[in-house]
C-alpha cells in the first residue's frame, strides 16, 4: 500500500488514522527534504490533488482539513514543490479509514449440524463497521468453569471434540475494532439440544392421473435421530404465500407425501426438519419444482375411468441441482 513508500518527511492524521465516519479530520504533512524549503505543499487523495481547505502552518508543514469525512478508505499522500526541482517531490503517504464501532452482537446462535463434528456459532453483527472488526467467541463450561476463546472475522466452527467440559456451556461474543468493543449477552446451551438433523432432501415427484390427480413427493434424510418433526411447504410459482404441511417422521425409509394439486401448474416444494421438541430447524431445502399435468377429460363410464386409472399415466420430476432458496427462517 501507500504506507510502504520511502518518505522524505512525515504525514499524520488527527484524531487518528482510523476514525469515526462523518468526523472532521485534519491531515498534516511535514517535509524533511535535503536542500528544500518547499515553495508549495500538495495533498493527494486517491491520486487526485486536493484544492481546498489547505493551510500552510510553517515553512515545512501544511494541513488539509476535511469536514464530515464519509469515505471508508482513502490513500493520502503529500508532495513538495522544491526550489530548483521541476517535479514535485514525494514526502510521504498514509492509508486512512473511517467507520463505526461495532454494535452489540445479538441473536447469538449455536447449532451442531448432524455428522459435521462441529458446533457452528453465528450472531447478528449489527450495522456495517467498514473497518476491520474481529470477534472473540467465548465458550465456558458450566460444569468445569473452563473457558475457551476463538478469534474470527464472522462465524465460528468449533470442533465438538474440543468441547470436553460436559454438555452445558455459556457462549458469548465480543466484537472489537479500532473504534470500540462490545459484548453480547450470554447464551446458555446444552449440546444435546442444539443438534440439527442431517439435511432433508426432496428426491423426486410424480403425479398420478386418476379421477382426482395426486402428486407424491419423495424425500429423505440420512439422520440417525429417532424423533424428527418436519415441515413441507409448497406453492404455485406464481403465488406469494406458502402452504405448509407438518409431519412426524421416521427416516428408516424414504418418505412419501401426497398432495392434491391444481392441474397444469408449476409448483415449488421445500422441506425442513428438527429434532422433535428442540429449538432449531434445518434451513429450508433447495427449491424443488414440479409441473402438474393437464386434466384428463372426464368420462362418465366407470369402466373407462377405471381403465384410465389402470393406464397409470404419470408425470414425474426428479431432483437435479436445484436453485438454492433464500434462507429466511433457517434456524430457530
Amino acid at each position: 500500500g501507500i504506507t510502504n513508500i520511502n518518505c522524505s518527511g512525515h504525514i499524520w492524521v488527527e484524531p487518528a488514522t482510523i476514525f469515526k465516519m462523518g468526523m472532521n479530520i485534519s491531515i498534516y504533512c511535514q517535509a524533511a527534504i535535503k536542500n528544500c524549503q518547499p515553495r508549495k505543499l500538495h495533498f493527494y487523495k486517491n491520486g487526485i490533488k486536493e484544492r481546498f481547505q489547505i493551510t500552510r502552518i510553517n515553512k515545512t508543514t501544511a494541513r488539509l482539513w476535511y469536514k464530515n469525512f464519509l469515505e471508508p478508505h482513502a490513500s493520502m499522500y503529500c508532495t513538495a514543490e522544491c526550489p530548483k526541482h521541476f517535479q514535485e517531490t514525494l514526502i510521504c503517504g498514509k492509508d486512512i479509514s473511517s467507520g463505526y464501532p461495532p454494535d452489540i452482537p445479538d441473536e447469538v446462535t449455536c447449532v451442531i449440524y448432524e455428522y459435521s463434528g462441529n458446533m457452528t456459532c453465528t450472531w447478528n453483527a449489527g450495522k456495517l463497521t467498514y473497518i476491520d472488526t474481529k470477534y472473540v467467541v467465548h465458550v465456558k463450561s458450566l460444569e468445569t468453569e473452563e473457558e475457551q476463546q476463538y478469534l474470527t472475522s464472522s462465524y465460528i466452527n468449533i470442533s465438538t471434540d474440543s468441547l470436553q467440559g460436559g454438555k452445558k456451556y455459556l457462549v458469548w461474543v465480543q466484537a472489537a475494532n479500532a473504534l470500540g468493543m462490545e459484548e453480547s449477552k450470554q447464551l446458555q446451551i446444552h449440546l444435546d439440544d442444539i443438534v440439527i438433523p442431517s439435511a432433508a432432501v426432496i428426491s423426486r415427484a410424480e403425479t398420478i392421473n386418476a379421477t382426482v390427480p395426486k402428486t407424491i413427493i419423495y424425500w429423505d434424510s440420512q439422520t440417525t435421530i429417532e424423533k424428527v418433526s418436519c415441515e413441507m411447504r409448497y406453492k404455485a410459482t406464481t403465488n406469494q404465500t406458502w402452504n405448509v404441511k407438518e409431519f412426524d417422521t421416521n427416516f428408516t425409509y424414504v418418505q412419501q407425501s401426497e398432495f392434491y394439486l391444481e392441474p397444469n401448474i408449476k409448483y415449488v416444494f421445500q422441506v425442513r426438519c428438527q429434532e422433535t421438541g428442540k429449538r432449531y430447524w434445518q434451513p429450508w431445502s433447495s427449491l424443488f419444482f414440479h409441473k402438474t399435468p393437464e386434466t384428463v377429460p372426464q368420462v362418465t363410464s366407470k369402466a373407462f375411468q377405471h381403465d384410465t386409472w389402470n393406464s397409470g399415466l404419470t408425470v414425474a420430476s426428479i431432483s437435479t441441482g436445484h436453485l438454492t432458496s433464500d434462507n429466511r427462517g433457517d434456524i430457530g
Epitope: R39, Y44, I48, E81, P83, H85, F86
Partner: antibody
Amino acid sequence: QVSLKESGPGMLQPSQTLSLTCSFSGFSLTTFDMGVGWIRQPSGKGLEWLAHIWWDDDKYYNPALKSRLTISKDTSKNQVFLKIANVDTADTATYYCARLQGSDFDYWGQGTTLIVSS
Amino acid sequence: QLVLTQSSSASFSLGASAKLTCTLSSQHSTYTIEWYQQQPLKAPKYVMEVKKDGSHSTGDGIPDRFSGSSFGADRYLSISNIQPEDEAIYICGVGDTIKEQFLYVFGGGTKVTVL
C-alpha cells in the same frame, strides 16, 4: 514588465569560443526560486536546453554538452552569460535566454543567431 | 530515458476546437510538463503547465480559450474557438533530476495550421 535580450557575435569560426550575454529587466536574480536558462534552436529544428543558473549561483548543464559549457551571472548588472568552447558547425542556431521561475521558462528573449563557418 | 512525443502537424478549421497531445515516456507518466507556443519567426512563448491530475496554470497574456488536461502519460493542450493567430508550433517540455543530473527536454513540436 519582464524582458530579456540576448547578444552574441553573430558569426564564429570552428574551434572558437562562443560568448553570449542575456540582459534582463523586470525581475532580480537575487530573488528566491528565480533562475535564467539558455536554450538553442537550429534552423527548422527543435529546441535544446543548454544550461541554467539559479538565484543562489547553483548551475545545471545539459549532460551531453557539459564539458563545453560555462554559465555565470552578474546580479548587479542583471546579466547572465554562457560560454561554449570549441564551437562547430553543429552549433549554428538561434540562442535564447529565458527566465526560470519555479519550473517554468515563463519569459523568453527574442533570440540571437549564431553561424559557425570557416 | 526522459522522452516527450508529439505528432508533427495538425490542421483545424477556424472556430473549431483543437486538442494537442504530448506523451511522456512510460516511466515518467506522473510528471508535470510545460507547453510553449512558437509563432513563425518568433521566440517561444510560455503557454501553461499541466500536472498529472490535469490541473494547469496558464502564462501571462494567454487567452482563456487555452486549457490543459491529462490522462495517464498523455498531457493535452486544448484550444477552443481556434483563431488565425493560434497558428504556430506547440512544443511541450519537461525537466527532472535523474541520477544526480538535471535534464530538460523538449518534444519535437506540433505544427498547427488554421484553415
